[in-house]
């Protein structure tokens, strides 16, 4: 019997120090480039090998970045978000949302607070 897939959403503050080749990741999203339907948020699409983010180890592909150095990333054009990262300075503080896939019990068993009912 197949299990039901749910998601555990957590938030984390990640402080990165810009390396010789920068922060070392790619982003998708923005009001003009929605990656997730009905969500103009900014998502991590690539972690570059041996870059600052990869060496730190906490930022993951698929994470949603909520803010950079305290500046909210809501309702930004894609290029404006890119520019914000590029101009963020040497020490960069990211507020990120991790979405971890978790396997629950068999289909048909709904736990408390399950939105699918």
């Amino acid at each position: 019997m197949n299990g039901r897939v749910d998601y555990l959403v957590t938030e984390e503050e990640i402080n990165l120090t810009r390396g010789p080749s920068g922060l070392g990741f790619n982003i998708v999203g923005g009001t003009d480039q929605q990656y997730v339907s009905n969500d103009s948020g900014i998502y991590v699409s690539r972690i570059k090998e041996n870059g600052a983010a990869a060496l730190d180890g906490r930022l993951q592909e698929g994470d949603k970045i909520l803010s950079v150095n305290g500046q909210d990333l809501k309702n930004l054009l894609h290029q404006d978000a890119v520019d914000l990262f590029r101009n963020a300075g040497y020490a960069v503080s990211l507020r990120v949302q991790h979405r971890l896939q978790v396997q629950n019990g068999p289909i048909g068993h709904r736990g408390e607070g399950d939105p699918s009912g």
């Epitope: 922060l23 990741f25 790619n26 999203g29 699409s45 690539r46």
Partner: nanobody, 128 residues
Framework: DVQLVESGGGLVQAGGSLRLSCAAS????????MGWFRQRPGKERDVVAT????????YYLDSVKGRFTISRDNAKNTVFLQMNSLKPEDTAVYYC??????????????????????WGQGTQVTVS
């Protein structure tokens, strides 16, 4: 991690056509830039064609322009390389490649400079 499985290679006569397919799994395909590389006997592995995650930007090696077409089907998690007017010098092992798409937060890079994060096992194309 991303798993890439190529298919569609084979033996074809000069002037003929082949269509290579690469099925991807392991993470959302729609956020991946995809590419095709080839390694000819005794040569380096070269980028042949790339397509970005949105499908609106492509790159081709000069020697295949007008003959090869790269395309993607996000619903099927697959990238294709349509190869027409094949020549004996197109004989090679063809590899599917993938990397996370989007914009680098550090600097621009040329779409032809395709640093792959993931590779397929390759499929042999022989043009006689």
């Amino acid at each position: 991690d991303v798993q890439l499985v190529e298919s569609g290679g084979g033996l074809v006569q000069a002037g003929g056509s082949l269509r290579l397919s690469c099925a991807a799994s392991g993470r959302p395909f729609s956020s991946l830039d995809m590419g095709w590389f080839r390694q000819r006997p005794g040569k380096e592995r070269d980028v042949v064609a790339t397509i970005n995650w949105t499908g609106d930007s492509t790159y081709y090696l000069d020697s295949v322009k007008g003959r090869f077409t790269i395309s993607r089907d996000n619903a099927k998690n697959t990238v294709f390389l349509q190869m027409n007017s094949l020549k004996p010098e197109d004989t090679a092992v063809y590899y599917c490649a993938a990397r996370g798409g989007g914009s680098s937060v550090d600097s621009e890079y040329d779409v032809g400079e395709f640093e792959s994060d993931y590779w397929g096992q390759g499929t042999q194309v022989t043009v006689s």
